[in-house]
């Protein structure tokens, strides 16, 4: 059993059927000595007298809020919640797993630019009783700070019969050097809590392979004379990292139809225009990533040809 | 411990290229090393990351953008001092600022130098030949050293009596590649900064 | 699967016009550029132009340009090139090539042998 | 237009060993490059495209890489039916060139 914060109490407990579970002594915060009571939750059914209670926990029912009692004012509260291992492996049921880049992947983390902000985002399918709680730190045997703000549902989708929905939090690296050469990775950990079931999860990575530049802004065509081709010109994103001639990106540009089976022109450049064959119906699309450390494409930014 | 903005003329950097050459020489070689070493933990998320050059150079101090010394965080440099005479500073006007940030690339380069040839000499008694260092990313070290062109004491080759560990030299081998790729990222960086200024 | 078939070769006098066609088979023809690239005996390849034969749209290297035409016919799933002017040094193998990508070509004809002689 | 060398024209290579042909353009061209192999009486094959995209169907012992102005055609075991010309291509701008070939020819 451990401190989640102050009353809240986590018991790890070995799920299997017959398990014999754990056994928990809980202490009333008071000086008082005599005339204790224990309750469970909204029960006045009392378990227990004196200043500890001890119980077994085995199961679901045998966590929550405690409670002691002396001539019905109320004492201190002691929430016991559940942590699961199941074949040596801790529970992941309340996040989606999300499969990408690999299999068991519940945190995804992106940062637009060098500057030590980034912002993670997770899936769940549950709605209600849920709290999740975010930290952050640059390594994890001398860790560096890493500031996260509260978790906040970002988007609510419809998938199939059910609902999904999805959190995210930002995080900033409290004295980043956007230059800098990562040697310890940034470590993200999501304690979440649905109903009495604790649950955690963990995300390990450099700010470089997380880099996913915004798309180009300012995105202009100018037909050529005398010829199907276009030049197209755009800017790099206001949110990319400066000066831009040390953090370079590169760029793919593309016409293409509606339907990405359509043919297509493309081309890539290191530079802010390009001159493509444009058609009717088709659109000109651009995108951007990191020229020398090649992490994610940014999304694209379009125009119609006509 | 910045680069000055006002330097070389466009298109008189000669170590653009090489650099460019550099970064695609060594990522190449870190994603041959991850596919003949895949039973090996030589991924980025495996490997310690350890930096050969920590306390010795500061080429990331000594090359920092003038527009990042503003930047409290990226001022927390050692300083190092280094002869200050190469051919890629193509114009009368460079700075000794620039000097320095060129000299440290120069003398991450011999270090990493020498480390890959040490290395290498160990790969080749492996019985299974498993793997070796690309001789073309050996090649484009020594021509980025040569555009560079600076003078510094020779660096003598570690030699070994002791029989090699093959699996520590082939773990040590990716430590390495994934440190010089970083570093070649951050060289590719300061080159293109001061090609364009 | 996809295939482009070509004509015949061509004996051809200097100053004359010759056209090579090109029937596409598997897959819709007018998802696909179609492209003209010519090899002369014992060289290299060199790229004439291309058609978009949904809309006809088509562009030549500048060293043809005003002696080659391409065109396409829909209902036959067939490009054309015709070369004007026909002088010793157009003597070479035509290929057409095809892809959804405007800019390079996974699929190649046969080839057809043009000679040019008086 | 973007003129494309090839190095070298020629590489006599012995059957099983490793093969690098090497494709330099005038002119930067990011990654918009092109390989094919062509035997003789045949029609060009595409290997690899924008670099270092590898083909389904093509063998995994055919690799590219480079960017800029210098890039490198790999056969990292050459087998009998390898021997042929490769020439690399650039989509940079139109008009689109080719690099003039290079025989690999067994040694």
């Known amino acids: 059993i451990w401190e989640l914060k102050k009353d809240v109490y986590v018991v790890e407990l070995d799920w299997y059927p017959d398990a014999p579970g754990e056994m928990v002594v809980l202490t009333c915060d008071t000086p008082e000595e005599d005339g204790i009571t224990w309750t469970l939750d909204q029960s006045s059914e009392v378990l227990g007298s004196g200043k500890t209670l001890t119980i077994q926990v085995k199961e679901f029912g045998d966590a929550g809020q405690y409670t002691c009692h002396k001539g019905g004012e109320v004492l201190s509260h002691s929430l016991l919640l559940l942590h699961k291992k199941e074949d040596g492996i801790w529970s992941t049921d309340i996040l989606k797993d999300q499969k990408e880049p690999k299999n068991k992947t519940f945190l995804r983390c992106e940062a637009k630019n060098y500057s030590g902000r980034f912002t993670c985002w997770w899936l769940t399918t549950i709605s209600t009783d849920l709290t999740f709680s975010v930290k952050s730190s640059r390594g994890s045997s001398d860790p560096q700070g890493v500031t996260c703000g509260a978790a906040t549902l970002s988007a609510e989708r419809v998938r199939g019969d059910n609902k999904e929905y999805e959190y995210s939090v930002e995080c900033q690296e409290d004295s980043a050097c956007p230059a800098a050469e990562e040697s310890l990775p940034i470590e993200v950990m999501v304690d979440a809590v649905h109903k009495l079931k604790y649950e955690n999860y963990t995300s390990s990575f450099f700010i470089r392979d997380i880099i996913k530049p915004d798309p180009p802004k300012n995105l202009q065509l100018k037909p050529l004379k005398n010829s199907r081709q276009v030049e197209v010109s755009w800017e790099y994103p206001d949110t990319w990292s400066t000066p831009h001639s040390y953090f370079s990106l590169t760029f793919c540009v593309q016409v293409q139809g509606k339907s990405k089976r359509e043919k297509k022109d493309r081309v890539f450049t290191d530079k802010t225009s390009a001159t493509v064959i444009c058609r009717k119906n088709a659109s000109i699309s651009v995108r951007a990533q990191d020229r020398y450390y090649s992490s994610s494409w940014s999304e694209w930014a379009s125009v119609p040809c006509s | 411990r910045n680069l000055p903005v006002a330097t070389p003329d466009p298109g008189m950097f000669p170590c653009l290229h090489h650099s460019q050459n550099l970064l695609r020489a060594v990522s190449n070689m870190l994603q041959k090393a991850r596919q003949t070493l895949e039973f090996y933990p030589c991924t980025s998320e495996e490997i310690d990351h350890e930096d050969i050059t920590k306390d010795k150079t500061s080429t990331v101090e000594a090359c920092l953008p003038l527009e990042l010394t503003k930047n409290e965080s990226c001022l927390n440099s050692r300083e190092t001092s280094f002869i200050t005479n190469g051919s890629c500073l193509a114009s009368r006007k460079t700075s000794f600022m620039m000097a320095l940030c060129l000299s440290s690339i120069y003398e991450d380069l011999k270090m990493y130098q020498v480390e890959f040839k040490t290395m290498n000499a160990k790969l080749l008694m492996d019985p299974k030949r498993q793997i070796f260092l690309d001789q073309n990313m050996l090649a484009v070290i020594d021509e980025l050293m040569q555009a560079l062109n600076f003078n510094s004491e020779t660096v003598p080759q570690k030699s070994s009596l002791e029989e090699p560990d093959f699996y520590k030299t082939k773990i040590k081998l990716c430590i390495l590649l994934h440190a010089f790729r970083i570093r070649a990222v951050t060289i590719d960086r300061v080159m293109s900064y001061l090609n364009a200024s | 699967q996809v295939q482009l078939v070509q004509s015949g070769a061509e004996v051809k006098k200097p100053g004359s016009s010759v056209k090579v066609s090109c029937k596409a088979s598997g897959g819709t023809f007018s998802d696909y550029y179609l492209h003209w690239v010519r090899q002369a005996p014992g060289q290299g390849l060199e790229w004439m132009g291309w058609?978009?034969?949904?809309?006809?749209?088509?562009e030549y290297a500048p060293k043809f340009q005003g002696r080659v035409t391409i065109t396409a016919d829909e209902s036959t799933s067939t490009a054309y090139m015709e070369l004007s002017s026909l002088r010793s040094e157009d003597t070479a193998v035509y290929y057409c090539?095809?892809?959804?990508?405007?800019?390079?070509?996974?699929?190649w004809g046969q080839g057809t042998l043009v000679t040019v002689s008086s | 237009d973007i003129v494309m060398t090839q190095s070298p024209l020629s590489l006599p290579v012995t059957p099983g060993e490793p093969a690098s042909i090497s494709c330099r353009a005038s002119?930067?061209?990011?990654?918009?490059l092109h390989w094919y192999q062509q035997k003789p009486g045949q029609a060009a094959r595409l290997l690899i495209y924008?670099?270092?995209q590898s083909i389904s169907g093509v063998p995994s012992r055919f690799s590219g890489s480079g960017s800029g102005t210098d890039f490198t055609l790999t056969i990292s075991s050459l087998q009998p039916e390898d021997f042929a010309t490769y020439y690399c291509q650039q989509s940079n701008s139109f008009p689109l060139t080719f690099g003039q070939g290079t025989k690999v020819e067994i040694k």
């Open positions: 090539a095809r892809n959804k990508e405007l800019r390079y070509f996974d699929v």
């Open positions: 058609i978009d034969p949904e809309n006809g749209d088509t």
């Open positions: 924008f670099a270092s």
């Open positions: 002119q930067s061209i990011s990654i918009n």
